[in-house]
């Protein structure tokens, strides 16, 4: 579990003005430091889906990346705990599932991961900028929260192809553009010298394309990894709203687990006995670095270029932390 | 440039709730990661939380002090993130920022390589 360690603070830079190279070096052992220190630091995904073959209908999937065991998961919609959201569904690992309309199936997928298939008309039925929020109540973590809400630039009447790279950072651009002169002038050279010895030179194409292929794979993720990790949106209406469902369901206590099924009652050897549907083996999912699982054989990812807030094309694979396989 | 204004901010009552919110302006497409800090009076920048989006997936941690107590959202299409602030104790009382983070950054790592940073709002918890 983290610890606070004392990190020297850093004023805001003024805009435009990076902090000079000595600077970073001074602040780097701090920073290992640190990493050291919060390496268990507990991480909530949440993933939110249209699905294509049915309209209006949300597959919302939600993870703890995290060393404790989950006791209680619950799933919200119309915004976190405090800010106005509702209960979807509740999920304890040994006293069963209770789900509440508009959501139609919910069930652990492992013993730290939930999905929840919701699907409305009219008034009970979600939007496209819906928030969704899955609480997980952990021991020893504790409660943690997490939002997430559709893409916006998910248009179902688009297929997209796989999201291209970014544009180039500047300074990695600069990086790039010596290497290449470097690279030409070699190759230049060689052709000269091929011309000279009047013999044919060796085969140049994997060292001209060699010191940039890593770079590049860092940057994109592959159509497979991509393929694997989306699924086809649906056009959803336009008109909903979460439905106040406070009065359906009580909040107070544990009481309403009494209604669930007996056999829900001891605790199962796997996640599969805890919800009331079952869950697809474990080979069909593919395990992914940072515990995301995702059906494998779906088509690649409905986000065109027109992505407004932070998109990060590199795919859920990066800038995770330490996230053991499960 | 990216622009990050904060608000929200004010005074609450302890064990009240606050909700902050950050928009972003400018060029935005170019960040993929959004994180909260906050100073104390006298004390250090410390991490508060982050936010990561990925296609379809959203990816959130928080400092250990956070315990539950806040909620850490965004909203893609109006460019705009919140922290939802429940349970406040005296000691959250500080000045809060928003912080657009580079696509490689570890959010573990406290302040350290923050590329662009709002001016902060106050937020006092009185007991």
């Known amino acids: 579990m983290r610890t606070e360690a004392q990190v020297p603070a850093l004023q805001p830079p003024e805009p435009g003005l990076e902090g000079a190279m000595g600077h970073r070096t001074l602040v780097l052992p701090w920073v290992l430091l640190t990493l050291c220190v919060t390496a268990g630091t507990p991480e909530v995904w949440v993933q939110v889906r249209m699905e294509a073959t049915e309209l209006s209908s949300f597959t919302i999937r939600c993870g703890f990346l995290g060393s404790g065991s989950i006791s209680l998961v619950t799933v919200s919609w119309g915004g976190p705990n405090g800010a106005g959201g509702t209960t979807l569904a509740v999920l304890h690992p040994e006293r069963g599932i209770r789900q509440w309309a508009p959501a139609r199936q919910a069930r652990w997928e492992t013993q730290s991961s939930i999905s929840l298939i919701l699907e409305g008309s009219g008034a009970s039925s979600p939007c496209a900028n819906t928030t969704f929020c899955c609480k997980f109540a952990s021991f020893p973590e504790g409660s943690w929260e997490a939002c997430g809400s559709l893409p916006p630039s998910s248009d179902p009447g688009l297929s997209a192809p796989p999201t291209p790279a970014p544009i180039l950072r500047a300074d990695l651009a600069g990086i790039l553009g010596v290497s290449g002169v470097l690279l030409f002038g070699c190759v230049y050279l060689l052709h000269l010298l091929r011309r000279h010895k009047h013999r044919p030179a060796p085969r140049l194409q994997p060292s001209r394309t060699s010191p940039q292929a890593p770079r590049a794979r860092a940057w994109a993720p592959s159509q497979a990894s991509q393929a694997a990790l989306h699924v086809p949106y649906a056009t959803i209406n336009t008109s909903c709203r979460p439905a106040t469902l406070d009065t359906a369901h009580p909040h107070g206590g544990p009481s309403w687990w009494a209604s669930l099924p007996t056999h829900a009652a001891h605790r199962p050897q796997g996640p599969a006995a805890w919800a009331s549907t079952p869950i697809p083996a474990r080979g069909s999912f593919v395990s992914v670095e940072n515990g995301l699982y995702a059906q494998a054989g779906e088509r690649p990812p409905h986000t065109g270029p027109g992505l407004t807030l932070f998109p990060d094309p590199r795919g859920p694979r990066a800038m995770e932390g330490p996230l053991g396989v499960r | 440039q990216l622009q990050l204004v904060e608000s929200g901010g004010g005074l609450v009552q302890s064990g009240g709730s606050l909700r902050l919110s950050c928009a972003a302006s400018?060029?935005?497409?170019?960040?993929?990661?959004m994180g909260w800090f906050r100073q104390a009076p006298g004390k250090e920048r410390e991490f508060v939380g982050r936010?990561?989006?990925?296609?379809?997936?959203?990816?959130?941690s928080y400092a250990d002090f956070v315990k539950g107590r806040f909620t850490l959202y965004g909203n893609q299409a109006r460019n705009t993130v919140y922290l939802q602030m429940n349970s406040l104790k005296p000691e959250d009382t500080a000045v809060y920022y928003c912080?657009?983070?580079?696509?490689?950054?570890?959010?573990?790592?406290?302040?350290?390589?923050?590329?662009?940073w709002g001016k902060g709002t106050l937020v006092t918890v009185s007991s």
């Open positions: 936010i990561k989006w990925s296609g379809d997936t959203t990816y959130t």
């Open positions: 400018g060029r935005t497409r170019s960040m993929y990661v």
């Open positions: 912080a657009a983070l580079p696509s490689d950054y570890d959010y573990r790592a406290a302040s350290y390589g923050v590329d662009y």
